[in-house]
Structures are given as C-alpha cells and as structure tokens.
Amino acid sequence: CRTSECCFQDPPYPDADSGSASGPRDLRCYRISSDRYECSWQYEGPTAGVSHFLRCCLSSGRCCYFAAGSATRLQFSDQAGVSVLYTVTLWVESWARNQTEKSPEVTLQLYNSVKYEPPLGDIKVSKLAGQLRMEWETPDNQVGAEVQFRHRTPSSPWKLGDCGPQDDDTESCLCPLEMNVAQEFQLRRRQLGSQGSSWSKWSSPVCVPPENPPQPQVRFSVEQLGQDGRRRLTLKEQPTQLELPEGCQGLAPGTEVTYRLQLHMLSCPCKAKATRTLHLGKMPYLSGAAYNVAVISSNQFGPGLNQTWHIPADTHTEPVALNISVGTNGTTMYWPARAQSMTYCIEWQPVGQDGGLATCSLTAPQDPDPAGMATYSWSRESGAMGQEKCYYITIFASAHPEKLTLWSTVLSTYHFGGNASAAGTPHHVSVKNHSLDSVSVDWAPSLLSTCPGVLKEYVVRCRDEDSKQVSEHPVQPTETQVTLSGLRAGVAYTVQVRADTAWLRGVWSQPQRFSIEVQVSD
C-alpha cells in the first residue's frame, strides 16, 4: 500500500486489545481544506517504540488503515480511499511492547466536520442572579455549537465548565462569579452533535472582576488651613490593586476598579450643592468647613462597599477680623472682602449645641465696599442670632458657589447675640474687707465670658459717696476679682462692674454699697 492511501489489508500486527489503562485516546478528525483532512489523538503512557495506526471502516463494512508511525497526527486527501461524503467509523490502534491498545471509536462524516472558531470579537459580560453571563455573536455560518469555558483565579489552576448546546445567532454562557477575586475566562466551541469533532482554539482571555469591588483601604490627611482659607486633602495610602490571574496581567479590560471620592460639605447647608464626586487621583482643596468624605470603589458590576471619614471643621478663630455694629434697625457685620463678585455664606450656631443646628444665610454676589469690606445685615425681626447666648460664626466665600471644591473660609469667630451689653452684666457682686484701707470685689463671670474672644475686659467703678469722686479699674477678662485700695474708713462707697466687648460698652451692675469700719483702739 502507498503511504498516502488508506490500506485495505490486514494491519501488520495481531488484532488483540490489551485493555490497558494507557493507550490512544481523544481522537479528533476534521476537514482542513477543500480536499484535505486531519486526525489527531493523544497517547497516554511511555511513547518509546510505539507505532500508531489510524483505522477506518466504511459504511459498506470494508476497513482500512493509515500507518502513522510514532506521530499522533495524520493528514490525508479526499482521494486516499476514505469516503468523506458518507459516515465512517475511525479509531486508533497503537502497537507497543507486543500488545495493541485501542482508542474509543468516533463515527462521523468527514466532509462536514470543520474546526469551529472560538468566540471572536466582543464578549459581553453581565451579572445574572449571582452568576456571570457571557454573551457573544456566533461566528458567521457556524450556528449550532457545543461550548466550554475554563476559568482560573490568581491562586487556582484552570477549571473546566460547560455552557451547553447553542443554536442561535448569539451564544451565551452562565459561569460562576467569585465574590472577592478576579477571574480569567476562556471559551471554545465545536460542532454540535458531531461525534469526534475538534474543539476550536481557546478564545482571548475574558477578565472578570470580583462581584464585590475591593474595599478601598486608604487614609487621608488634611493640611493646615492656608492664608487663602483653604486646606489640601491628601491621600496618605493608595488603594490596594486587585490581584489578577496570569492572562489578565498588563492590560485587562473588565477588571478595572475605579475609586471615586465623594465629598459632602456639612457646613453652610443653605448653599446650592452639598456633594461632589471626584476621581481619587485628583485630590481637592477644601475650606475649613466640616466634611464627610467617602471613597467608593466600583467595577463593571457596580459600586462596592465604601469607606467614610469625617473631616472636622477647622476651629481656628480670628477674633479681630469681624466687626459687628448693632443699631436700632438691626445688626450689620463687616469683614475684609475676598475679591470682586463673591458669594458669602454666613453660618452661625449656638455654642455647645449639636452641629446640626447651624443656621446660615447666602449673600448675593457682592463687590467690596470702598473700605474693602464685605457686609451682611439682618433685622431684629429676622430673629437671627437674636437670643442672648454665644454663637459661633463662620464665613465662607466662593466666586463659584455651585462648585463645592471652590469654597474657602474667610473667618471663624464668636459673637454674643441679642442685647449683649445687658445680658453680659456681671451678677453677684460682693465686697469683702481686705485690710484697713482696701476691699476685695468679686463677681460671677459675665455670660460674655462663655464666648471666646468676645469679652474684652471688665471695668470696676468705685464711687465715694461723700466727695462724689469716681475711680474706674480695668480688669482682665479672665479675672473676676479686684482689690480696691486707698479707701478711707467710715466713708460710704458704691461699687459697680460692667463687661465690655470690643465694639460695645456693657451695662453697669446694680450699685453695691459698702464702707470700711473705723477701728477703735483699746
């Protein structure tokens, strides 16, 4: 027989199947061109001295063989004596160590047996009821396929899975979705219902992120508030990168995790926009306001868990920057203007109360007045800062109030509301003898002292009721006691105390009468 033909004679070895565990298996035959065909198989066991024979039986019952030698692949033409248009049965017999080993048989029509293409082009990935759904367009003119997938994680080997039979212009596969690790998938196809048909090559890798994007493990730090009333938010620790399977390393579209920074400005609730979402790489400048910051991780399946932080307000105060004048019509604040056409947000809240009770007012865009000052006025009827208590005031400014990251802090200070001069009057003034010509005057702290920076000083006034002479003694705002000396025994005096702010003189306390008793010597 010629080597290119299927030999219709008995093969050159005895016909006996050893039934051993080793031997030829996984025979695949398919058409490789208009007139050529190929069969390939695997051989399990020691290969030394093994001779392979491809056996073929026609539907007529006649059988022939090709001698392949030690090769496990053999090509033949449609003129080799094998009927390609009709069903044939093929198997491999391997002659080794004086015994014959036989592969399982495959029965097929060679003419129609073509090797399919793997899924080509765009493979769409989505999540369906906790599983992964892959979908792709069936390669043209190859409808009717059996599809398999294989998948691996960074730490596990390939695992094989079945997609089942497909018979449409689009094919799809349901695959397992890992919760916390990325996966690499590959798909392959073969003719449906054709025994012994050959699998296509594996498709290009499909890289799939975990169902849950990794929780961002990042840390922030906030710089000091600068002269411009802004402070930089900086990232101390980058988010950890997702570990990828081998075929997804480098460029792995599909597994990307995007981290976004969500800023929520808690201060100044009357502004138009309270939240802004930014890319994590672009770290913003913030005002001195209080913020909540969240880092949100998301992948193609949506957002994951987020990590949140609270950035407290910068409480550094500048007591001299704000001027407040109280008139009959109402109250006006003045402060150094930032620039032309600025919108200001004035926020106030009673000291010692929850931050949620802050009130604020937004000004229309304003230019500085001739003295370079910006102003905000309110009437008594408005009730703003009307109660006689300490308020914490912060003023923010922005040329673009709709942009959350462009606000800056102008100043933070304290203000005592209502009728501060009356409310601040010291009470419980008491006089105690100190020596033969002096007394100690004590009083309860003024309500103004609860308001840092508001109380400028106490003034103690002593009046000689005989001569009508008056002396005034300034006292540090931290003190609530003063010694009056140079007094004369037997003379009646009255003492009063007032509390002054930088812009307001206080109201005198009720006069307190006293005298130093004349000492009678024995």
Partner: nanobody, 127 residues
C-alpha cells in the same frame, strides 16, 4: 428565513466563460453551505458544487472539476456566491439553481439536504 436570487445566466459559445451570482439575504449567518445545481428538461437536478461558508472549502462534481470555480463574498447580512464557469461545453446547457443549507449533516449532492432554493437562471452553451 433566507432568500436566494440568481443572476448572470445567458447565451455563450462553446469554450467560453460565464459568471453566475447568487445573492443570499435574511438570516444568512445561520447558513452552513451554499451550492449550485443544474437541471435540463426531463432530468433530475444535478449537483455542480458547494462551498462551506465558514471555511471557504469547496467541492465539485467530477463533471465540472477543473473548469468551474465557486467563491463567495460577504456583506452585512448578505452573502453572494459566484460560479465561475470556463471551457464551457454544450452539455453544460441547463437551468442553474442556487441552494443553501443550514445543517452540518448529509451529503452535499443530495437536493433534500438544502432548505433554500433560488428561482434559477438559464445558461445556454451554443456551438
């Protein structure tokens, strides 16, 4: 559903050449193969040749081998199959039909393997 329309038939001298076209439209992605058959009055349809679409593998009847060539071109949702005929003989005179199948089994020369057929185009070879 697939529609097939042939064109290009006509009168040609012995030894001459002619190119037939068959335009397939509709769900052409489901097709496995397209073929040419011919029929003369009072006779069965005779297989001429076939092309496996996904691989461009061709197969011809012995009577036309070496003289006829089948090819195809793809456009969006349309496949055009061609039959280039050269060295024409008077016995090539017939109505030429285009056929298409969407199953992977069966003998290419059997008419019952094909689900879709064109209306035919006349080829006359005169001496």
């Amino acid at each position: 559903e697939v529609q097939l329309v042939e064109s290009g038939g006509g009168l040609v001298q012995t030894g001459g050449s002619l190119r037939l076209s068959c335009a397939a439209s509709g769900r052409t992605s489901r097709l496995v193969a397209m073929g040419w058959f011919r029929q003369t009055p009072g006779k069965e349809r005779e297989f001429v040749g076939e092309i496996i679409l996904s691989k461009d593998f061709t197969y011809y009847a012995d009577s036309v081998k070496g003289r006829f060539t089948i090819s195809r071109a793809n456009a969006k949702n349309t496949i055009t199959m061609y039959l280039q005929m050269s060295s024409l003989k008077s016995e090539d005179t017939a109505v030429y039909y285009c056929a298409a199948r969407q199953n992977w089994s069966g003998h290419p020369a059997r008419t019952n393997e094909y689900e879709y057929w064109g209306q035919g185009t006349q080829v006359t070879v005169s001496s």
